[in-house]
């Protein structure tokens, strides 16, 4: 199992939405996906989670975009705010 | 129903101040940017304000700048515009609005009037 | 602050016409320009978002178009209920920052 994300560093205007990359690789036929938020203090705050089997997710101000054909699970932030500075991280689980 | 609804206009002396009040129904409030827009008697649209979802981010105009004040009690779906040393140039019709999350005001008050004279 | 030039400020059209009002801005803006409509003593309700895409319920007679500094609203075939003023409004950067307006009239 694998996961990568490319991007490094992001850097977005308030109000904007910003898009998050994540590709991954599974020999699980069924898994999840899990996006978390870390606070400067390290710790790891859930943010959503994509089911392989499941529809985009959604909850509030965050979205998946889940191409699992092509193993990518994208995590857009809509309507950005300063809080939202953060290091972001995606997870693969069963 | 989504809706939002303005209160607290009136008249006011110059100098004088007003709080308004925007109550909103039918969306989860806290996942919105809210704003604040007048429009001046016959005149066109102005916007005044806007606070993040959250609150921690705020910006004005700067005909407001330091005498103006949004803020939001997201456990009470409710937006609010403090306005102190008013001035009579600040008399207009006073709408909340809702920003999506493309950047449109895609839900609007009804309005309050606010009526700035001696 | 970016400027937004309305065109024209006013206009006189009979049902049926195609019309078109135009938006020009100062600098440059992507797609973060909308449309709103507005009656006498009403607020203004939104018709196009993100320079060309039409909002829920807003009927298909309305189109939005442009990017950059240049933007046009057309309404394909007039109806009575399409007199009122209309706004652009650019979301791109603070302050936000609508047009002067342009009021559509019965000829």
């Known amino acids: 199992q694998k996961v990568t994300q490319a991007q490094s560093s992001v850097s977005m205007p308030v109000r904007k939405a910003v898009t998050l990359n994540c590709l991954y690789e599974t020999s699980w036929w069924s898994y999840y996906i899990f996006w978390y938020k870390q606070l400067p203090s390290k710790e790891m705050i859930f943010l959503i989670r994509q089911g392989s089997d499941e529809q985009n997710a959604k909850s509030g101000r965050y979205s998946v975009n889940f191409k699992k054909a092509a193993k990518s699970v994208a995590l857009t932030i809509s309507a950005l705010q300063l809080e939202d500075s953060a290091k972001y991280f995606c997870a693969l689980g069963e | 129903e989504v809706q939002l609804l303005e209160s607290g206009g009136g008249l006011v002396k110059p100098g004088g101040s007003l709080r308004l009040s925007c109550a909103a129904s039918g969306f989860t409030f806290s996942d919105y940017y809210m704003s604040w827009i007048r429009q001046a008697p016959g005149k066109g649209l102005e916007w005044v304000s806007y606070?993040?979802?959250?609150?921690?981010?705020?910006y004005y105009a700067d005909s407001v700048k330091g005498r103006f004040t949004i803020s939001r009690d997201n456990a009470k779906n409710s937006l609010y515009l403090q306005m102190n040393s008013l001035r009579a140039e600040d008399t207009a019709v006073y709408y909340c609005a809702r920003e999506n999350y493309l950047n449109a005001f895609d839900i609007w008050g009804r309005g309050t009037l606010v009526t700035v004279s001696s | 602050d970016i400027q937004m030039t309305q065109s024209p400020s006013s206009l006189s059209a009979s049902v049926g016409d195609r019309v078109t009002i135009t938006c020009r801005t100062s600098?440059?803006?992507?797609?973060?320009l909308n449309w709103y409509q507005q009656k006498p003593g009403k607020a203004p309700k939104l018709l196009i978002y993100?320079?060309?895409s039409l909002q829920s319920g807003v009927p298909s007679r309305f189109s939005g178009s442009g990017s950059g500094t240049d933007f046009t609203l057309t309404i394909s075939s007039l109806q009575p209920e399409d007199f009122a003023t209309y706004y652009c409004?650019?979301?791109?950067?603070?302050?936000?920052?609508f047009g002067g307006g342009t009021k559509l009239e019965i000829k």
């Open positions: 600098q440059s803006l992507s797609n973060y």
């Open positions: 993100a320079a060309s």
């Open positions: 409004q650019q979301s791109y950067s603070t302050p936000l920052t």
């Open positions: 606070i993040s979802s959250s609150g921690s981010t705020i």
